[in-house]
């Protein structure tokens, strides 16, 4: 099974998985809600951007991000499948030149502006691992997914595959 | 390289349950969600469900109080049941693995070469 | 559940010729349509995903676009064993749905 965690045995190659060309292969403009239908909104607070987790009021409109997906190859002897995979990798804009980026070593997730080429820190695995719900794995760190702590997002560690549909990690799309 | 392989029982009572196994090779299923699709005679294309790497699963709407998908992913081994079976359920089963790793959004670009289910007394 | 029309059921064409089929979504898809290639007694085989995308191996006179809820799928300068039938798929929500088919037909 997931042993070594799946997620691990398949992405401990996420550090050197070659990302497709440098173009996204479609991107998409939708708003971000958690699996118990909480918005992530971002506010800009003293000319930095803060993400927050909230039910939003009746005619509150939902903020829109913009997700860019990109084909990642992976190479056979490190998925320890018997040929190379495809993986699909996300990065997500909420403004111009804002990307969520993983800070591993505060176990946070922030928005930073940068500029293209974008930092691996940026990039996330996509899986939907739940019916109609997706997470995002770090690239940078195989194994800690985006999640929901304190009403805040952060980088949360999943060591087996049945904590893959834990609902913190699970995030739903959509474009209304 | 990347196998599924289906086997069945060819021929099922009507009222009577099946079960299928689509036995996979050349990757693992901790890493793939697989999907099962039917294919009935002179009609189209039908997506009866999907089981995901991580072990859930999805199911045609219609079909859903009659369907389970389950795996074991020791034995590379994925399995079909479905129960109180008649004459419209008469099709060529299939199953088939997604093209990116632990996600659907894809489709599959492998395929078993089915099995057929004729549903008769 | 998402609805797939495909259309047309059924289209005539000679070698050589460009056909199109369409697919309508009864609410936005983004861009995650598949469409399938099924020839008699054969498994089916993806052709494009992702709405664009060119599966491995697949000629370059097969192309898809669109993306929401209108999706195309043109085949180009048509060869002999490319008059079967085509499917196309959402996988944007589950159930993921197939559209109804398209049978090519030589003229």
């Known amino acids: 099974a997931f042993g070594i965690s799946g997620v691990q045995k398949y992405t401990r190659a996420l550090h050197d998985s070659s990302i497709t060309g440098i173009s996204p292969i479609t991107e998409y403009l939708a708003s971000l809600s958690t699996y118990n239908d909480q918005s992530i909104t971002f506010a800009l607070e003293d000319e930095s951007y803060e993400i927050y987790v909230e039910d939003l009021k009746k005619d509150e409109k939902k903020d829109k991000v913009l997700l860019s997906y990109y084909e990642s190859q992976h190479p056979s002897n490190e998925s320890g499948d018997g040929v190379d995979g495809k993986m699909l990798m996300v990065t997500l804009s909420p403004t111009k030149d804002f990307w969520l980026h993983a800070n591993n070593k505060e176990h946070s997730v922030e928005l930073h502006k940068c500029e293209k080429p974008l930092p691996d820190q940026a990039f996330f695995v996509l899986h939907n691992m739940h019916s109609n719900c997706v997470s995002f794995e770090c690239k940078t760190d195989p194994g800690v997914f985006i999640g929901v702590k304190d009403n805040h997002l952060a980088l949360i560690k999943v060591d087996s595959s049945e904590n893959l549909c834990t609902e913190n990690i699970l995030f739903k799309l959509s474009e209304t | 390289q990347v196998q599924l392989k289906e086997s069945g029982p060819g021929l099922v009572a009507p009222s009577q349950s099946l079960s299928i196994t689509c036995t996979v090779s050349?990757?693992?299923?901790?890493?793939?969600?697989v999907h099962w699709v039917r294919l009935p005679p002179g009609k189209g294309l039908e997506w009866l469900g999907v089981?995901?790497?991580?072990?859930?699963?999805d199911y045609n709407s219609a079909l859903m109080s009659r369907l389970n998908i389950r795996k074991d992913n020791s034995k590379s081994q994925v399995f079909l049941e479905m129960n109180s079976l008649q004459t419209a359920d008469t099709a060529m089963y299939y199953c088939?693995?997604?093209?990116?790793?632990?996600?659907?959004?894809?489709?599959?670009?492998?395929w078993g070469q089915g099995t057929l289910v004729t549903v008769s007394a | 559940d998402i609805q797939m029309t495909q259309s047309p059921a059924s289209q005539s064409a000679s070698l050589g010729e460009s056909v199109t089929i369409t697919c309508l979504a009864s609410?936005?898809?983004?861009?995650?349509l598949a469409w399938y290639q099924q020839k008699p007694g054969k498994s089916p085989q993806l052709l494009i995903y992702?709405?664009?995308r060119l599966a491995d191996g697949v000629p370059s006179r097969f192309s898809g676009s669109g993306s929401g809820t209108e999706f195309s799928f043109k085949i180009s300068s048509l060869q002999a064993e490319d008059f079967v039938i085509y499917y196309c798929?959402?996988?944007?929500?589950?159930?993921?749905?197939f559209g109804g088919g398209t049978k090519l037909e030589i003229k």
């Open positions: 088939a693995r997604d093209h990116y790793f632990s996600n659907s959004y894809g489709g599959s670009p492998y």
């Open positions: 050349g990757f693992s299923l901790t890493n793939y969600g």
């Open positions: 089981i995901r790497a991580g072990g859930s699963s």
């Open positions: 609410q936005t898809i983004a861009t995650w």
């Open positions: 992702a709405a664009t």
């Open positions: 798929q959402q996988l944007y929500n589950t159930p993921y749905t």
